[in-house]
């Protein structure tokens, strides 16, 4: 058993049929010595008396809010949550496996630049009685500070018969050094509580590996005289790190016909302009990637050829 | 060439070669889902590689003030990785074909380090740890870790030379 926060405790249980469970001793936070009784949740049934209460925790029916009273007055509470371990593996019932980039990916994170700011998100099908708390650091043995905000519900989607809820959190490294080569990964820890079930999820990454620039901005076409060619120009996204002579991007320019089956023409360039042939009913798209490190491409910025 | 103690490197040449290094490092070990290398026993493997750290003067301001600190750090790293890529970590099994990008990577690391340091002058170099794993799986794991680490190192070096070529070239 360990303390998650004041008056909230997590009991770690090996979860299998007829498991013996864990013996837990609760102590009433009071100077009083006698006349103390214990109840669980809203029930008025007295579970025991005395300053301490010993219970055998085996299942969710044994978890909940234990309250000690004296003469009708509440003295203190202890909330017991359960953390299940099945076949040596902690349960992951609350969050959905996003399966990208690999199986057992529950948390996904992205950064728009090298400033040390990043966003993580996760998915669940649970809509109520759900709380999250997020902590982060750089490195684990001698951790350096990363400050995370509160997790918020950022999107709701309907997937078949189910509703899916996306939560996200923003974090910022306290003393970020954008130009340095990271040697210690960022660690992100999410505590998830659904009713009386506790689970924790972790992710470990370097900012460089989760970089995904915003799409290029101000995408414009300039027809070239007496030609089917156009000059496409664009700018670095505002959110990208500066100076651009140091934090450079490379670009992919694509000409795509109306039909998905039509052959796509692609050009790669380090410049912020390119000359391409604009076909009727086609569109021109440009996306960006860090020039020197193969992290994710941005989403496409597009304009119609006409 | 970067004569230590003062004169500028051939920024544009260094920029071109460092960008080629980035491409080669990713060809040698593309991002594929075969292993999360940080989970696969991080013990004594690549902890000793030289990293370009915050105080090494490789940021735009540091380069403007005095690029020599940063160039020395980059040179140190290039020599270190060049020795690693020439070691039995990369020559043993699993066998690399002669067309492997590792061979070109090895040569290009040497080329860039020579651009930064002419013959006759020696910056101190970091000792290369004696890593000679006997099993193919240990060797392959080390290879992957070294190449992932090299990708990060050459990315910073390439930024330095790109910025230098754009703003510090005579």
């Amino acid at each position: 058993i360990w303390e998650l926060k004041k008056d909230v405790y997590v009991v770690e249980l090996d979860w299998y049929p007829d498991a013996p469970g864990e013996m837990v001793v609760l102590t009433c936070d009071t100077p009083e010595e006698d006349g103390i009784t214990w109840t669980l949740d809203q029930s008025s049934e007295v579970l025991g008396s005395g300053k301490t209460l010993t219970i055998q925790v085996k299942e969710f029916g044994d978890a909940g809010q234990y309250t000690c009273h004296k003469g009708g007055e509440v003295l203190s509470h202890s909330l017991l949550l359960l953390h299940k371990k099945e076949d040596g593996i902690w349960s992951t019932d609350i969050l959905k496996d996003q399966k990208e980039p690999k199986n057992k990916t529950f948390l996904r994170c992205e950064a728009k630049n090298y400033s040390g700011r990043f966003t993580c998100w996760w998915l669940t099908t649970i809509s109520t009685d759900l709380t999250f708390s997020v902590k982060s650091s750089r490195g684990s043995s001698d951790p350096q500070g990363v400050t995370c905000g509160a997790a918020t519900l950022s999107a709701e989607r309907v997937r078949g018969d189910n509703k899916e809820y996306e939560y996200s959190v923003e974090c910022q490294e306290d003393s970020a050094c954008p130009a340095a080569e990271e040697s210690l990964p960022i660690e992100v820890m999410v505590d998830a509580v659904h009713k009386l079930k506790y689970e924790n999820y972790t992710s470990s990454f370097f900012i460089r590996d989760i970089i995904k620039p915003d799409p290029p901005k101000n995408l414009q076409l300039k027809p070239l005289k007496n030609s089917r060619q156009v000059e496409v120009s664009w700018e670095y996204p505002d959110t990208w790190s500066t100076p651009h002579s140091y934090f450079s991007l490379t670009f992919c320019v694509q000409v795509q016909g109306k039909s998905k089956r039509e052959k796509k023409d692609r050009v790669f360039t380090d410049k912020t302009s390119a000359t391409v042939i604009c076909r009727k009913n086609a569109s021109i798209s440009v996306r960006a990637q860090d020039r020197y490190y193969s992290s994710s491409w941005s989403e496409w910025a597009s304009v119609p050829c006409s | 060439r970067a004569v230590p103690g003062g004169s500028s490197p051939a920024w544009t040449q260094c920029q071109q070669l460092s960008q080629k290094l980035c491409t080669l490092a990713w060809s040698a070990h593309p991002l594929v889902g075969h292993m999360d290398l940080r989970e696969e026993g991080d013990e004594e493997t690549t902890n000793d590689v030289p990293h370009i750290q915050c105080g090494d003067g490789c940021d735009p301001q540091g380069l403007r003030d005095n690029s020599q600190f940063c160039l020395q750090r980059i040179h140190q790293g290039l020599i270190f990785y060049e020795k690693l890529l020439g070691s039995d970590i990369f020559t043993g099994e699993p066998s690399l074909l002669p067309d492997s990008p590792v061979g070109q990577l090895h040569a290009s690391l040497l080329g860039l380090s020579q651009l930064l340091q002419p013959e006759g002058h020696h910056w101190e170099t970091q000792q290369i740890p004696s890593l000679s794993p006997s099993q193919p799986w240990q060797r392959l794991l080390l290879r992957f870790k070294i190449l992932r680490s090299l990708q990060a190192f050459v990315a910073v070096a390439a930024r330095v030379f790109a910025h230098g070529a754009a703003t510090l070239s005579p």
Epitope: - | H29, E93, P94, S95, L96, D99, P136
Partner: antibody, heavy 120, light 107 residues
């Protein structure tokens, strides 16, 4: 796109020789090794060896040394595999293939195969 | 030479079945193992490399696992178009060697 086109089927007498060609296109010929494999009827694959056209250096499976000569002609982007002293057990489909760009020998592109039949 | 012992040599399964083919290397090959599919009269087609990395365009029902000496190719839900021979291949050590193949048929 990368293509490897092999020469047509051959029927040979025991003791004679055969030279199979593999014309490459869609990539820099000198930049990658070209490998040869064979597959006897109803059998698995056997790796014979490779040539690296950049420096014309071949490497052979010891089991085929003296039996096989692998060469390359840079001017026509063609690799050749010559089998000498043919015996009936050399009857097989012979494939040329090129590996992944990362320098490890898993084979992405294959020629269509050339059936060599050795029969008196 | 490294021997790649592949089993079974043939197997028959129903559409939708989970199918497993194994390969045992005679010594440590790390994860330097590829799997190929060869349909009758066709050339081998790469499915998996580095023991578990799916090649571009290969359906997700194909997966590979294993390291050092023991390797597995799994088809999670057999489809009619999966009828073929399957070969494992070690590229750790010269001479590169292949398993003897598994002929997969539909019941």
């Amino acid at each position: 796109q990368v293509q490897l086109v092999q020469s047509g089927a051959e029927v040979k007498k025991p003791g004679s020789s055969v030279k199979v060609s593999c014309k490459a296109s869609g990539y820099t010929f000198t930049g990658q090794t070209i490998h040869w494999m064979r597959q006897a009827p109803g059998q698995g694959l056997e790796w014979i060896g490779y040539i690296y056209p950049r420096d014309d250096s071949p490497k052979y499976n010891e089991n085929f040394k003296g039996k096989v000569t692998i060469t390359a002609d840079k001017s026509t982007s063609t690799a050749y595999m010559e089998l000498s002293s043919l015996r009936s057990e050399d009857t097989a489909v012979y494939y040329c293939a090129i590996p992944d760009r990362s320098g490890y020998a898993w084979f992405i592109y294959w020629g269509q195969g050339t059936l060599v039949t050795v029969s008196s | 030479d490294i021997q790649m012992t592949q089993s079974p040599s043939s197997l028959s399964a129903s559409v939708g079945d989970r199918v497993t083919i194994t390969c045992k290397a005679s010594r440590d090959v790390a994860i330097a193992v590829a799997w190929y599919q060869q349909k009758p009269g066709k050339v081998p087609k790469l499915l998996i490399y580095w023991a578990s990395t799916r090649h571009t365009g290969v359906p997700s029902r194909f997966s590979g696992s294993g390291s050092r000496t023991d390797f597995t190719l799994t088809i999670s839900s057999l489809q009619p178009e999966d009828v073929a021979d399957y070969f494992c291949h070690q590229y750790s050590s010269y001479p590169f060697t292949f398993g003897s193949g598994t002929k997969l048929e539909i019941k």
